[in-house]
Amino acid sequence: AITEAREEAKPYPLFPGPLPGSLQTDHTSLLSLPHTSGYQPALMFSPTQPGRPYTGNVAIPRVTSAGSKLLPPLAFKHTVGHIILSEHKDVKFNCSISVPNIYQDTTISWWKDGKELLGAHHAITQFYPDDEVTAIIASFSITSVQRSDNGSYICKMKINNEEIVSDPIYIEVQGLPHFTKQPESMNVTRNTAFNLTCQAVGPPEPVNIFWVQNSSRVNEQPEKSPSVLTVPGLTEMAVFSCEAHNDKGLTVSKGVQINIKAIPSPPTEVSIHNSTAHSILISWVPGFDGYSPFRNCSVQVKEVDPLSNGSVMIFNTSASPHMYQIKQLQALANYSIGVSCMNEIGWSAVSPWILASTTEGAPSVAPLNVTVFLNESRDNVDIRWMKPLTKRQAGELVGYRISHVWQSAGISKELLEEVGQNNSRAQISVQVHNATCTVRIAAVTKGGVGPFSDPVKIFIPAHGWVDHAPSSTPAPGNADPVLII
């Protein structure tokens, strides 16, 4: 996606500082940087802080140990002031200075835009000693320059607690346009206008933008970066990209797909996770969303019973999670279930229908005509009842559950008995004398335990009392009958 149309028409020569012994004569401009005429002392006082010396490029003259001769001020020699080069090229520049041999331990550091360059940079300092002075050349090289190498570079030399600073070398890296904003993929409504943005920078500036739709240029004249393309509307998917051009060549952005929003595809793989007598838990796999987020889904339920009126129950639910518990169903019934989902454009078709069944339910009515009487000779309580009239959906009767509660003088004790479906009577042992026994009976199917009958109470006297009169629940089971003995 990146091509370079051409390199600079001419190379940009580097002008290193003079080698030892040579003179610099070009004082025409900043590009080879002249001093002021006459050296200025290094210890200038700061305008706003009178006590703070300004340590500049020039170290002030020093008297030799013999005290006989002044040393010249120290300053970096002038070098090229501005280097322009293309990205990925190599560059080398340097600072040079001649230091009298009486100075020891000179160190040169490189700085870029106020920060010291440490570590992985290629800085080499070479020393050329002579009788009285040592010429020092500090070279800095960058291989395959990047835009981030743009900046103002300076040398600093520490010498006798003085800091001598060179004039700057401006490094300007040019290259192919670099995108700061590329078009983004979008999902749009059919025939509705939308905007795409593309922005790229140099250097070199300017950067011009061409838009491309499905491999064809949209604009004949380039637009200055940043560029906003207004597309009046699409009827089908399209791919857009932008070309950024500058004097170095062109860079092409990523291609982005613009999709047209449509109704979703129907959900698939509707499956049953759990069935109870009155509910079914289903899940589904959403279909393709039509490039527009799902808003909600609709679960449609039809009873399969040929005698039913064929009406459809509709349950609306959120699009996520892709699961729904259908409630308020009849027990032991067959249903056909489908799912449809919608986005901003509309509803999908319904998924393939699946069959599901509810399980049998618990009985809905209690046993009838419950009667209780005391058989004192056997020291037990006889219980009798009539089988309840259960619906088919409640399933097959598997038995009965008897609850008997014994209460006397602040003590209460409940016991449960299970009996088979063929029985309509039971006997329970007397648990406590001089107490009240309260009996309730519920029918049981595979679907669960039905409601208990109304309670029937019988008083169990102390030993020696005889009374065979029953307590009973009159059909259809009314108030709280109790036998008073």
Epitope: Y12, L30, L31, S32, H35, G56, G114, V165, D167, E172
Partner: antibody
Framework: QVQLQQSGPELVKPGASVKISCKAS????????IHWVKQRPGQGLEWIGW????????KYNENFRGKATLTADTSSSTAYMQLSSLTSEDSAVYYC???????????WGQGTSVTVSS | DAVMTQTPLSLPVSLGDQASISCRSS???????????LHWYLQKPGQSPQLLIY???NRFSGVLDRFSGSGSGTDFTLQISRVEAEDLGVYFC?????????FGSGTKLEIK
């Protein structure tokens, strides 16, 4: 972002001196040259000189040598220009500007008006 | 010194017209490193100069593509393809190849 903020207008008497300031922000002050430019009312622009704040080196237009003195204070990122022995010819708007990487005066201060009048 | 001669001094235009400003130097502005340091500025009334074109033909960041620069050696031109009201002001050229830096005398772009 790069900004150069200059001091306010000055009304001074002939023969006096004035010192105007240019506070830089948004970049490394010690790494880029600051230039000063003069503009007399209704006239063109005249380059006065430059200072490199990193080491204090200066260069002057010969027409302004002895008239303008350029200094910089790195602790406050401020460049200064002192104009001395003022005459009516020195009444002008003075601009500071940064010499950017592209080797052009890319950002300018808003200008300081100096009026010399008795 | 490099003397910069700018013409015309005044340029009356109608909005939407093309405008062309010339700047001629008394010596070549090509520096020893191969670059030509000739820049163009616009100074709107009551404002500081603002950089438009640097090194002959490069538009500065944010400058509209109606502005273009060309030339080499000693002769340079700034063109505005379709003048708009916001373009009105004084245009200056500036050379920074030689010290002292020197400006053109300015061209005032005004409505006809």
């Amino acid at each position: 972002q790069v900004q150069l903020q200059q001091s306010g207008p000055e009304l001074v008497k002939p023969g006096a001196s004035v010192k105007i300031s240019c506070k830089a922000s948004g970049y490394s002050f010690t790494s880029y040259y600051i230039h000063w430019v003069k503009q007399r009312p209704g006239q063109g622009l005249e380059w006065i000189g430059w200072i490199f704040p990193g080491n204090g080196n200066t260069k002057y237009n010969e027409n302004f040598r002895g008239k303008a003195t350029l200094t910089a204070d790195t602790s406050s990122s401020t460049a200064y220009m002192q104009l001395s022995s003022l005459t009516s010819e020195d009444s002008a708007v003075y601009y500071c500007a940064r010499l950017g990487l592209i080797y052009a005066l890319d950002y300018w201060g808003q200008g300081t008006s100096v009026t010399v009048s008795s | 010194d490099a003397v910069m001669t700018q013409t015309p001094l005044s340029l009356p235009v109608s909005l939407g017209d093309q405008a062309s400003i010339s700047c001629r130097s008394s010596q070549s502005l090509e520096s020893s490193n191969g670059n030509t340091y000739l820049h163009w500025y616009l100074q709107k009334p009551g404002q500081s100069p603002q950089l438009l074109i640097y090194r002959v033909s490069n538009r500065f960041s944010g400058v509209l593509d109606r502005f273009s620069g060309s030339g080499s050696g000693t002769d340079f031109t700034l063109q505005i393809s379709r003048v708009e009201a916001e373009d009105l002001g004084v245009y200056f050229c500036l050379q920074v190849t030689h010290v002292p830096f020197t400006f053109g005398s300015g061209t005032k772009l005004e409505i006809k």
